[in-house]
């Protein structure tokens, strides 16, 4: 679609006669008739296929046509058409005398011509207008004339239909050849594209609008390459989306398992140091003076029995004094002045002499223990039982109450994870220091081999037009989620062109 | 036990500003992404803001944008919401919730109320 | 914006029964929904995740199902503690947005 443009400039008539010689009277005034046609080789009469304009009456005799409109009339002179421009024309132009004010062809007497020229030739679609001047023996017209497109218009032949737009459906101006031309911010071949925000991650990101950084289900961050843990975690991180990696000092599932409760809590009293001894336990281990669970509780230093053979222990302000039967002496009345001969060895325990007889070492039967066989053993002294276990004498023997989550008989072994049967889909389960590990079978991953996994449909690229893959997992089926302007099980068919485009 | 409880609400003249806080307990704060979540009297919900965990990118309704300001304080366990130019249309219960905008909201406070009214 | 659409918007059933809540997406949210029920005067509670993942804690008589555009939330036995508001929340596309909710009272 353009449009045939038509400047008249001058017409001189000098001596106001007609084609026939004729003189008009008083004076020729004067209008024209333009008609536009397909290229002729000889311009004959016939129709005018692309279009003709008539004038009103612009001047008398010889005169200048004013640019724009001159009674009423536009100047330059518009011949419309609505197909390609073929590059070639005829144009045959008329001057005619208006004796009165019915300008219709059918109203004027057939020698009221002025003047007819035809000319013919090629004319290209552009802004430049091409200066013509055509002489007879009694007038002369000069004229310019060009061809241009119609708005929305481009190209050589002005076939190429380009509006431009900044909507749903595009975002863009049109140049001159009549390709579009992206406005900032926007791509693709209709500019629906738009450009997210520099480093924008190409998989886990998205923008609806230009420099925005959306993050897909499971990211986020400004660039979107950050991922979220799991729903339910507690105190963990992740390195992929959902997953839960338990901070130090936390395990299970969701890291909601205590396993440094001593950091976490500070259980221990009294300056005692606190041992992590498992899940949500531990053990405080007290300083002098002090005993419970906690250490919370302040006794007397003579309580733990400090006197050694059978010394007597005086509580002191700054600490206790033993008194050490004949034969001791020491701090904690340690050291021995008796010999083999004194028969220091009691309840059956054997004498033995060291260093030339200046000294001595018993040598204990079953069930006692002491530098002199004086003491009942407690099978509990040397804190047999392990992971926080609860060591309870039994008459000759001993027995371990163990914590939760261990078993054994020194509570030296976990109770297993596993037990639960927690691994889905038939993984295998094997038990960790601090948890569990599932090993998952083919088309199963996760934690707990709770997802199912499968070929992955997406990895052929089967989805056309900038599309996003998404792999189903139940059907091991491939989905695309097209862009604007795309349908079809792959996006393959464009959509929503205006329907007077021509391709 | 996750737990998270709000405080600074109160009735405010359209306008107005008022600053809403979140004190959160029971899980590693610095990890998980934040939101605000709102509920006019006798409506449904209504996302208000999210925060990143990772590097505070935050997040807006239209409606609220340029007159809401989210932001937290790790070290403090706390998310806060400031609000300002108050309209009688940001009258509601306001939730802090754990998630971003595009994860559910796994965890919830028990609601601070916002009367914005003259 | 995409719009979710809950049905019905309120109903009535005994204990024991079995009751089905929809929610319609207004495009493809892939299975990125969640249900949250909330009860008078409290904060709204996750149900469950990515369409048909039990939040911890969540009875199992809680269950969803759908994909695309059409999800289902059902209760499989209504104990007298489900009487609630129910909500279906969408977080594929941004911003998130909220069903109108479905109230579940008791006949």
């Known amino acids: 679609s353009g449009v045939f443009q038509l400047q008249l400039q001058e017409f001189i008539n000098e001596r106001g006669v007609l084609a026939s010689g004729r003189p008009c009277e008083p004076g020729c005034r004067t209008f024209f008739r333009v008609c536009l046609k397909h290229f002729q080789a000889v311009v004959s009469p016939g129709p005018c296929t692309f279009g003709t304009v008539s004038t009103p009456v612009l001047g008398t005799n010889s005169f200048a046509v004013r640019d724009d409109s001159s009674g009423g009339g536009r100047n330059p002179l518009q011949l419309p058409f609505n197909f390609t421009w073929p590059g070639t024309f005829s144009l045959i132009i008329e001057a005619w005398h208006a004796p009165g004010d019915d300008l219709r062809p059918e109203a004027l007497p057939p020698d009221a011509l002025i003047s007819k020229i035809a000319i013919q030739g090629s004319l290209a679609v552009g802004q430049n207008w091409l200066l013509d001047e055509q002489t007879s023996t009694l007038t002369r017209l000069r004229y310019s004339y060009r061809v241009i497109c119609s708005d929305n218009y481009y190209g050589d032949n002005c076939s190429r239909l380009c509006k431009k737009r900044n909507d749903h459906f595009g975002h863009y101006v049109c140049q001159p050849d009549g390709n579009l031309s992206c406005l900032p911010g926007w791509t693709g071949e209709y500019c629906q594209q738009p450009i997210c925000l520099s480093g924008c991650h190409e998989q886990n990101g998205y923008c609806s609008k230009p420099a925005e950084c959306l993050c897909r289900p499971g990211w986020q961050g400004r660039l979107c390459n950050e991922c979220i843990p799991h729903n339910g975690c507690r105190h963990g991180t992740c390195s992929t989306p959902w997953q839960c990696t338990c901070d130090e000092g936390w395990g299970g599932l969701f890291c909601d398992q205590d396993l440094n409760y001593c950091t976490h809590h500070s259980p221990c009293k009294n300056g005692a140091t606190c041992s992590n001894s498992g899940q949500r336990s531990y053990t405080c281990t007290c300083r002098p003076g002090y005993t419970g669970v906690d250490c919370e509780l302040e006794l007397s230093e003579c309580d733990s029995n400090p006197c050694r053979n059978g010394g007597s222990c005086k509580d002191q302000e700054d600490g206790y004094h033993c008194l050490c039967p004949p034969g001791y002496y020491g701090l904690h009345c340690e050291h021995s002045t008796l010999s083999c001969a004194d028969s220091p060895c009691f309840n059956g325990g054997s004498c033995r002499e060291r260093n030339q007889g200046a000294n001595y070492a018993c040598e204990c039967p079953p069930n006692f223990t002491g530098s002199n066989c004086e003491k009942k053993v407690d099978r509990c002294t040397s804190n047999p039982c392990a992971n926080g276990g609860q060591c309870l004498n039994r008459g000759p023997s001993r027995m371990c109450r163990c914590r939760p989550g261990f078993t054994g008989t020194y509570c030296e072994l976990h109770v297993s994870d596993c037990a639960r049967n927690p691994c889905a889909h038939g993984g295998t389960c094997h038990d960790l220091e601090n948890g569990l590990m599932c090993t998952c079978p083919a088309g199963f991953s996760g934690r707990r081999c709770e997802v199912r996994t499968s070929i992955d449909a997406c990895a052929s690229s089967p989805c056309f037009n900038r599309a996003t893959c998404y792999t189903d997992l139940s059907t091991d089926t491939f989905v695309c989620n097209c862009p604007y302007g795309f349908v079809g099980s792959r996006c393959e068919f464009p959509v929503g062109l205006p329907p007077s485009f021509p391709w | 036990e996750v737990q998270l409880v709000e405080s600074g609400g109160g009735l405010v003249q359209p306008g107005g500003s008022l600053r809403l806080s979140c004190a959160a307990s029971?899980?590693?704060?610095?990890?998980?992404?934040m939101a605000w979540v709102r509920q006019a009297p006798g409506k449904g919900l209504e996302w208000v803001a999210t925060?990143?965990?990772?590097?505070?990118?935050?997040y807006y309704r239209d409606s609220v944008k340029g007159r809401f300001t989210i932001s937290r304080d790790n070290a403090k366990n706390s998310l806060y919401l400031q609000m300002n130019s108050l309209r009688a249309e940001d009258t509601a219960v306001y939730y802090c919730?754990?998630?971003?905008?595009?994860?559910?909201?796994?965890?919830w406070g028990q609601g601070t109320l916002v009367t914005v009214s003259s | 914006d995409i719009q979710m659409t809950q049905s019905p918007s309120s109903l009535s059933a005994s204990v024991g029964d079995r009751v089905t809540i929809t929610c319609r997406a207004s495009e493809d949210i892939y299975s990125n929904l969640a249900w949250y029920q909330q009860k008078p005067g409290k904060a709204p509670k996750l149900l469950i995740y990515d369409t048909n993942n039990l939040a911890d804690g969540v009875p199992s008589r809680f269950s969803g199902s759908g994909s695309g555009t059409d999800f289902t939330l059902t209760i499989s036995s209504l104990q007298p503690e489900d009487f609630a508001t129910y909500y279906c929340q969408q977080y594929n596309n941004y911003p998130p947005t909220f069903g109108q909710g479905t109230k579940l009272e008791i006949k």
């Open positions: 919730s754990r998630g971003y905008y595009n994860s559910p909201f796994a965890y």
């Open positions: 925060i990143s965990s990772s590097d505070g990118t935050t």
């Open positions: 029971g899980f590693t704060f610095s990890n998980f992404p």
